[in-house]
Each structure stands twice: as C-alpha cells, then as structure tokens.
C-alpha cells in the first residue's frame, strides 16, 4: 500500500460544494476507488469488465460521481465547517495485475467564502 499526499489539486470549489478529484494512471482498466473522510468510507465506485469486455460501473455507497479515463470525481454539496477533514482517495487496482492499493489524500480547509447559503 502506498500512502502519500496528492501531487495535484484535489479539491475544486464551486457553488457551495466541492469536487474531490481522485486520479489513477491511464493504464489502469479495472479498479475500485473509495473516498475516505478520516477512516470512514463516504463514497465508492468500481469499474470492472466481464469476460466479453463489457464494462460495469458499480457504486455501493452512492455519491454523485463522475468517471473519466484517468480520474474519478466525487461531489460533496452544502458545505459547512463539519466537512473540514482529511480526505483520502483509496485506489484498488485489479487490472493490470498485480493487485495494488494506493492511498493519496489531503486536508479540506473550509473558508467562509466557500460555504453555501451564508447568512449575512
């Protein structure tokens, strides 16, 4: 298992919400990506292929997510101060072998300017 800080901008703020970007190498074809808040699984997305190369996308913990060819984005809405925490992208690579797990993360700072529906 590889642990480290994300070497890219992991948090993108917009409209009182945040897009959390979890990247994976282009070569990875089948994987599970989990978003952890501290040690708690908030979201997950699994991409696999069957014996005829049919792709299946599965989410056990439902979050609004977006898949591209080298990243999974998870979206959190209605930010408040309780969202401030360490967030980790926990990537399990099934294909290509060998099976590997990598963990990258960063701290989500919440500032007043990023909060939704501020009271004036």
């Amino acid at each position: 298992e590889i642990n480290g800080s994300a070497n890219y901008e992991m948090f993108i703020f917009h409209n009182g919400g945040v897009q959390i970007l979890c990247k994976y190498p282009d070569i990875v074809q089948q994987f599970k990506m989990q978003l952890l808040k501290g040690g708690q699984i908030l979201c997950d997305l699994t991409k696999t292929k069957g014996s005829g190369n049919t792709v299946s996308i599965k989410s056990l913990k439902f979050c609004h997510s977006q898949l591209s060819n080298n990243s999974v984005s998870f979206f959190l809405y209605n930010l408040d101060h309780s969202h401030a925490n360490y967030y980790f992208c926990n990537l399990s690579i099934f294909d290509p072998p060998p099976f590997k797990v990598t963990l990258t993360g960063g701290y989500l700072h919440i500032y007043e300017s990023q909060l939704c529906c501020q009271l004036k």
Epitope: Q30, N53, T54, S56
Partner: antibody, heavy 117, light 111 residues
Framework: EVQLVESGGGLVKPGGSLKLSCAAS????????MDWVRQAPGKGLEWVGN????????NFAPSVKGRFTISRDNAKNTLYLQMNSVKSEDTATYYC??????????WGQGTLVTVSS | DIVMTQSPSSLAVSAGDKVTINCKSS??????????LIWYQQKTGQAPKLLIF???TRHTGVPDRFIGSGSGTDFTLTITSFQTEDLGDYYC?????????FGPGTKLEIK
C-alpha cells in the same frame, strides 16, 4: 480457498426446463462477474453467458439467447442458470466460472445435463 | 464473432520434449498494449485450469516451463520440457469482445 460447486444437472426431455445452481465460497461473491461455460461430451469449451456483480448486465452466447437466463443471489452467494426449451445440442457438462478480471481463474467441477427423450 | 483456431489438433509427445501449440484469432486481440488472449489446461475428467493470461503472463503457481507468446492474431503456448503431468487438452480463449470464444483445443498424448 475459492470453491464453486454446481448442482441441478440431470436428464431432461427436449423442450423441457432445468435450473442449475452454483454455490460460491471463499471469496466476496458480489465483487466478481460470474460465467457459465459448457462442454459437450468429447468436445471443446463453449461460453454460455455471464452476469455482472449485481445482475444489471447479462450477456449470452447466440446459441442460447432467448432460451437461457442467468441470475444471481448475492445474499446466498449463488449463481443460477435457468435452461428453457432445451435441445439435444444443449447436452453438456456445465461449469460455473469466476471471471477474475482478466481470465477464468476458478472453475467448479461441473454438472452434467443430458437432453434426451 | 471472433473465431479462434488452434494447431495442431493433437500431438504425441515424450517427456523432455519441447512442445509448441499455436492459436490464431480472426481479428487482432491487441488493445491498449494488451493482448486479450488466455490459455487453459484441462486434464481428463477435470475442470479447466488457468495457465496464461494477457498472452504471456503466467498465473500464480504455474510452472515456468509454460511460456505464452505472440501478439495481434498469432499466439503460441510453449512447454519447454514436457512432463507427463502436462498431459491433457489445451485451449486458447479471447476476451476482446462479446462473445468470448475458445479455440477447439489441442490434445497432448504420450508418444
């Protein structure tokens, strides 16, 4: 240890129905696509069909499409093959197999289905 | 559908022989740098066992005398020094598209 155990095979008349089961253990069943593969006596291997983790995607070989259905019960760790309108050419040993992301890495011992009047 | 062919259909061999089994696909199995080609061994009365995936990667526990090679449409399984426990049928299979199909098999028999 991964184990797949098929059951439900036997003698069935042409046009009849039969339901095969495959009990899985030793791994997280819901994490894997599962397949059925058959082998006629003295012949080679023929893919029958597959099902994704939660049964949302099911594919069949042209030779069985419209006659066979595949389902799974993740709570019971069991895979099923419902065979309807069977023909003599469906006579075979039926194997359930785990698709381990890039190959069939585990197979059951097989169950023999004989279609004869 | 992709058609898989194998040659020879059967082969008589002796212990220590180098054995070569060929597999050909009706279209290229190469995608994103990987060949979607698998080899299985099946002994009499048993279920098939995985030997090689992605054309050349040995499955866990498979002896290193089994070597997979080839790319595109032409593939080879080589047993560098045949052992009597290697008797049985050998099948190639593609998983490039649906339906995944198997070759007709190659039977290895004792000379």
């Amino acid at each position: 240890e991964v184990q797949l155990v098929e059951s439900g095979g036997g003698l069935v008349k042409p046009g009849g129905s039969l339901k095969l089961s495959c009990a899985a253990s030793g791994f997280t069943f819901s994490d894997y696509w599962m397949d059925w593969v058959r082998q006629a006596p003295g012949k080679g291997l023929e893919w029958v069909g597959n099902i994704d983790h939660d049964g949302n995607i099911i594919n069949f070989a042209p030779s069985v499409k419209g006659r066979f259905t595949i389902s799974r019960d993740n709570a019971k760790n069991t895979l099923y093959l419902q065979m309807n309108s069977v023909k003599s050419e469906d006579t075979a040993t039926y194997y359930c197999a785990r698709w381990g992301h890039y190959a069939f890495d585990s197979w059951g011992q097989g169950t023999l289905v004989t279609v004869s009047s | 559908d992709i058609v898989m062919t194998q040659s020879p259909s059967s082969l008589a061999v002796s212990a220590g022989d180098k054995v070569t089994i060929n597999c050909k696909s009706s279209q290229s199995l190469l995608s994103s740098g990987y060949n979607y080609l698998i080899w299985y061994q099946q002994k009499t009365g048993q279920a098939p066992k995985l030997l090689i995936f992605y054309a050349s990667t040995r499955h866990t526990g498979v002896p290193d005398r089994f070597i997979g090679s080839g790319s595109g449409t032409d593939f080879t399984l080589t047993i560098t020094s045949f052992q009597t426990e290697d008797l049985g049928d050998y099948y190639c299979q593609h998983h490039y598209s649906s339906p995944p199909t198997f070759g007709p098999g190659t039977k290895l028999e004792i000379k």
